[in-house]
């Protein structure tokens, strides 16, 4: 298969240990989605990582060994974006309450919300626990970093014709061989210190003019502050 | 209904080659890695490997590696495995099975794959 | 390659009893695990993906427990028709692929 050789996340690399200390694991008794920690008591992730019972897994590297820096706590409150669209993914976001405060520090602490929308071209690092393979399944126990640019809504557009919505981008490449996959879900797209996306869809993983599709977390700044404060 | 139908049964000399051919109803087949699986008699189930129809993308188990080739053709919603250099331990029922995980506009969650779908098999004989 | 070790190679039970189907891999698969059951002559028809959900139109007293190493299939009461070949399989890491051996429910 193409993409085969440089089969990290697909085609990123081995994060630095802790190196990415807002991302977290979401855990049903194994890892299925990511998400990413906004401040001491919330975590944003994916609507379509909605569970019912979901543990929150902080300063996690290796998913399958604890090495001491690991915070596990239970979700208290799970809410998804009222407007969530199963078919379509619109709205594919969902926020999180944890039932008590991380301890912040060197290897968990939290990312800010975006200012401003994503520019074009923009290089952010997308990170997760997904599948490491463009085809078949090869799931990482270390966390996967990926550097991959910000793609015009033109070309995201053209690539997925009648599917992306003003709530989603495109980030990665048309030539293929570097995307998230399955595992990543709900992870973060940080761009210049800033959450712009969170893992959401795409056709396949890493293939040619199919980038992965994000949600745009900058129109949904206003409904996470005011369902935090709501929820506080 | 979803169902994948098999051809038919094949006599082969060893030495020779054999195509299976897999046709898939009643669902998107671009949308669905296929597998091949067999099945000695009186033994296991043996993962052959799979093929992305979307993309065309295969996946061989490394004892196949060189000996089978699968294809499609998405025209007519057709799956092939083609196993060549027939030995007589080759002779096996050879079942197509769909994954039931959708390849197109996939969210990232992990997925938890299956087969969900087979097909009703095809026996390969492989005799002098 | 991840290895899958199912026991016992076979079990004998009575209609009406439990029984209790083991599968083992040789490293951590998550919960990316099937059961399937095959009928002689029948191609295998898919009972549990997920290790533990149960697939359209399979009766509830067929269900599945464990995740990473550790998986079990449980029949809670057995039925004529229950009497089979079951096998698991790993989708965590492929290719390969990876089947177990089989149990075969007997009647005892």
């Known amino acids: 298969a193409p993409f085969d050789d440089d089969d990290k996340i697909v085609g990123g690399y081995n994060c630095e240990e802790n190196s990415v200390p807002y991302q977290v694991s979401l855990n049903s008794g194994y890892h299925f989605c990511g998400g990413s920690l906004i401040n001491e008591q919330w975590v944003v992730s994916a609507g379509h990582c909605y569970k019912s019972r979901i543990q929150v897994r902080l300063g996690e590297h290796n998913i399958e060994v604890l090495e001491g820096n690991e915070q596990f706590i239970n979700a208290a409150k799970i809410i998804r974006h009222p407007q969530y669209d199963r078919k379509t993914l619109n709205n594919d976001i969902m926020l999180i309450k944890l039932s008590s405060r991380a301890v912040i520090n060197a290897r968990v602490s939290t990312i800010s919300l975006p200012t401003a929308p994503p520019a074009t071209g923009t290089k952010c690092l997308i990170s997760g626990w997904g599948n490491t393979a463009s085809s078949g399944a090869d799931y990482p126990d270390e966390l996967q970093c990926l550097d991959a640019p910000v793609l015009s809504q033109a070309k995201c557009e053209a690539s997925y014709p009648g599917k992306i919505t003003s709530n989603m981008f495109c980030v990665g490449f048309l030539e293929g061989g570097k995307d998230s996959c399955q595992g990543d879900s709900g992870g973060p797209v940080v761009c210049n210190g800033q959450l712009q996306g969170v893992v959401s869809w795409g056709d396949g993983c890493a293939q040619k003019n199919k980038p992965g599709v994000y949600t745009k977390v900058y129109n949904y700044v206003k409904w996470i502050k005011n369902t935090i404060a709501a929820n506080s | 209904q979803v169902q994948l139908v098999q051809s038919g049964a094949e006599v082969k000399k060893p030495g020779a080659s054999v195509k299976v051919s897999c046709k898939a109803s009643?669902?998107?087949?671009?949308?669905?890695?296929m597998h091949w699986v067999r099945q000695a008699p009186g033994q296991g189930l043996e993962w052959m490997g799979a093929i992305n129809p979307y993309s065309g993308q295969t996946n061989y188990a490394q004892k196949f590696q060189g000996r089978v080739t699968m294809t499609r053709d998405t025209s007519i919603s057709t799956a092939y495995m083609e196993l060549s250099r027939l030995r007589s331990d080759d002779t096996a029922v050879y079942y197509c099975?769909?994954?039931?995980?959708?390849?197109?506009?996939?969210?990232?969650?992990?997925?938890?794959?299956?087969?969900?779908?087979w097909g009703q098999g095809t026996t390969v004989t492989v005799s002098s | 390659e991840i290895v899958m070790t199912q026991s016992p190679a076979t079990l004998s039970v009575s209609p009406g009893e439990r029984a209790t189907l083991s599968c083992r891999a040789s490293?951590?698969?998550?919960?990316?695990l099937a059961w399937y059951q095959q009928k002689p002559g029948q191609a295998p028809r898919l009972l549990i993906y997920?290790?533990?959900t149960r697939a359209t139109g399979i009766p509830a007293r067929f269900s599945g427990s464990g995740s990473g190493t550790e998986f079990t299939l449980t029949i809670s009461s057995l039925q004529s028709e229950d009497f089979a070949v079951y096998y698991c399989q790993q989708f965590h890491n492929w290719p390969p692929l990876t089947f177990g051996g089989g149990t075969k429910v007997e009647i005892k």
């Open positions: 099975a769909r994954d039931f995980v959708l390849l197109l506009r996939q969210s990232r969650i992990l997925h938890e794959s299956a087969f969900d779908i």
């Open positions: 997920g290790a533990s």
């Open positions: 490293q951590s698969v998550g919960s990316n």
């Open positions: 009643g669902y998107t087949f671009e949308g669905h890695y």
